[in-house]
């Protein structure tokens, strides 16, 4: 197993429908053609893989389990985007990238985005 | 509904390993999460570790992160939870439960869990 250096922004502001989006880069040493995306969570006393892709090299990512994650790649970026997000979701969100093919295998862990997520207010009753 | 049926528990030394089994009758539970929690004499029901639907995601407890392994067999309707280097602040009540969705990120609540087991007991001894 060797380390690759991954790249993230440290924090993320999610938007008002629950939304948070970020890139997630990766240094490959090699041209890898399969590559394995995880977003693990670390908050609460737990770390829970949140969601995870493998894909082909210009692929689109396909995301198992009913996943919260969509994403795109474009070259040794992973763009990604969680959906469904709550105040109570709030945490650190930690891109896991691996490459898988062909050998030797990579494997990269970024610092972590802390997402905040902020539950909107509800609106007023109005008489309008 | 489901029936969750545990196994496994037993009384071990400290440093020791126990294997927990989970077998489900009923309805099949290929399509949900599947988690273990435990509860010790005059404390809360607590989160452990669960197992997505498909297996690949997991979530676990950081005082057993690196000591404990969820996993699961679909085929045989059944979910396990190998546990090393037991501790004495492991011993607990141990339960198997059944999530109602596939996978969520509130999958160390007990309230996304529809069907519990009723618990198989862990003596970790010093």
């Known amino acids: 197993c060797k380390a690759m250096h991954v790249a993230q922004p440290a924090v993320v502001l999610a938007s008002s429908r629950g939304i948070a989006s970020f890139v997630c880069e990766y240094a490959s040493p090699g041209k890898a053609t399969e590559v394995r995306v995880t977003v693990l969570r670390q908050a609460d006393s737990q770390v829970t893989e949140v969601c995870a892709a493998t894909y082909m090299m210009g692929n689109e990512l396909t995301f198992l389990d009913d996943s919260i994650c969509t994403g795109t790649s474009s070259g040794n970026q992973v763009n990604l985007t969680i959906q469904g997000l709550r105040a109570m979701d709030t945490g650190l969100y930690i891109c896991k990238v691996e490459l898988m093919y062909p050998p030797p295998y990579y494997l990269g862990i970024g610092n972590g985005t802390q997402i905040y997520v902020i539950d909107p207010e509800p609106c007023p009753d109005s008489d309008f | 509904k489901v029936q969750l049926v545990e196994s496994g528990g037993g009384l071990v030394q400290a440093g020791g390993s126990l294997r927990l089994s989970c077998s489900a009758s009923?309805?099949?539970?290929?399509?949900?999460?599947m988690g273990w929690f435990r509860q010790a004499p005059g404390k809360e029901r607590e989160f452990v570790a669960s197992?997505?639907?498909?297996?690949?995601?997991?979530s676990y407890a950081d005082s057993v992160n690196g000591r404990f392994t969820i996993s699961r067999d679909n085929a045989k309707n059944t979910v396990y939870l190998q546990m090393n280097s037991l501790k004495p602040v492991d011993t607990a009540l141990y339960y198997c439960?059944?999530?109602?969705?596939?996978?969520?990120?509130?999958?160390?609540?007990?309230?996304?869990?529809?069907?519990w087991g009723q618990g198989t007991q862990v003596t970790v001894s010093s």
């Open positions: 197992l997505s639907a498909s297996g690949s995601l997991t």
């Open positions: 439960a059944r999530n109602r969705r596939a996978w969520s990120l509130s999958v160390h609540t007990t309230r996304e869990y529809d069907d």
């Open positions: 009923g309805r099949t539970f290929a399509n949900n999460a």
